[in-house]
């Protein structure tokens, strides 16, 4: 699924990533942007032979288990597969367990380049939440 | 199955340190997120911090200084200090995993001299 | 801190009877509330997490729901197993902190 990006804000919304450790719901709109596009279906592969699944693009090295990712942690306790529908409750639980360890929204390289430091409101901006 | 294991003294002086181990069985503690949380007579709860698989350390601040959550991960076990304990520090100590499934049986300290 | 407030702090029921549990919290913490069973002389049990996601292996009579400030637990068909007390635990800010607790005793 591709979601809509007010769509995807109350959605996130609705599962609790609104100030989730401090973080308003604009920068999770906005990693999601910048990490997936807004598809749940997103996934690349990377050099490390590590993959990354989802709408947060979360990776098989630590969170997931996508049985080909040498040494993966599985952090999150779950299949990859299940960071791919386009019911967000696995990715949103997952991202929450990750927020949660000291480097914040750091762990995404895209919110970090894109997100971090700008005006994450603005992606949020005339949604109706 | 995952279990969770608590030892220590269970008596401890006042203004002295509370030294607590979990050892873990069943994982790795590097692939979770390990807290301690006390319950104290009359059944309320306080969640006094965690760590994290990368070693990460979040504490409550309303135990400022006095607190320390350390691992040793080939012992696969966590440790909690506590300085400087008072009679208000009597209590049942319990490790758990961070997502709240797993816990150990909890071990009760009694801060008294 | 966020404060967790539960009521009522004592519940007396039937065996058979359908019962709620209220936590409220003092912020909006969007679903980010577990509800733990603890029992005398043993450790805490998830029941539910996220506010309404089921927990494998606990009984489907278990439910919760509600968002933002205000949530309930609802146990449908009290059986004698459940009697003892019942926490709730906001995880939306550092410190994570708990209600006071209901206790759910025998009529």
């Known amino acids: 699924k591709v979601f809509g990006r007010c769509e995807l804000a109350a959605a996130m919304k609705r599962h609790g990533l609104d100030n989730y450790r401090g973080y308003s719901l604009g920068n999770w709109v906005c990693a999601a942007k910048f990490e997936s596009n807004f598809n749940t279906q997103a996934t690349n592969r990377n050099t490390d032979g590590s993959t990354d699944y989802g709408i947060l693009q979360i990776n098989s090295r630590w969170w997931c288990n996508d049985g080909r990712t040498p040494g993966s942690r599985n952090l999150c306790n779950i299949p990859c597969s299940a960071l791919l529908s386009s019911d967000i409750t696995a990715s949103v639980n997952c991202a929450k367990k990750i927020v949660s360890d000291g480097n914040g929204m750091n762990a995404w390289v895209a919110w970090r380049n894109r997100c971090k430091g700008t005006d994450v409101q603005a992606w949020i901006r005339g949604c109706r939440l | 199955d995952v279990e969770l294991q608590e030892s220590g003294p269970s008596l401890v002086k006042p203004s002295q340190t509370l030294s607590l181990t979990c050892s873990v069985t069943?994982?790795?503690?590097?692939?979770?997120?390990w807290s301690w949380i006390r319950k104290f007579p009359g059944n309320k709860l306080e969640y006094m911090g965690y760590i994290s698989y990368s070693g990460s350390t979040f504490y409550n601040p309303s135990l400022k200084s006095r607190i320390s959550i350390t691992r040793d991960t080939f012992k696969n076990q966590l440790y909690l200090q506590l300085n400087s304990v008072t009679t208000e520090d009597t209590a049942t100590y319990y490790c758990?995993?961070?997502?709240?499934?797993?816990w150990g049986q909890g071990t009760t300290v009694t801060v008294s001299s | 801190d966020i404060l967790m407030t539960q009521t009522p702090a004592t519940l007396s029921v039937t065996p058979g009877d359908s019962v709620s549990l209220s936590c409220r919290a003092s912020?909006?913490?969007?679903?980010?509330l577990h509800w733990f069973q603890q029992k005398s002389h043993e450790s805490p049990r998830l029941l539910i997490k996220?506010?309404?996601q089921s927990i494998s292996g606990i009984p489907s009579r278990f439910s919760g729901s509600g968002s933002g400030t205000d949530f309930t637990l609802s146990i449908n068909t009290v059986e004698t197993e459940d009697f003892g007390m019942y926490f709730c635990?906001?995880?939306?800010?550092?410190?994570?902190?708990f209600g006071g607790g209901t206790k759910l005793e025998i009529k």
């Open positions: 912020q909006s913490i969007g679903n980010n």
């Open positions: 635990q906001q995880s939306n800010s550092w410190p994570y902190t």
């Open positions: 996220y506010a309404s």
């Open positions: 758990a995993e961070y997502d709240g499934t797993y």
């Open positions: 069943g994982d790795s503690i590097t692939r979770g997120y």
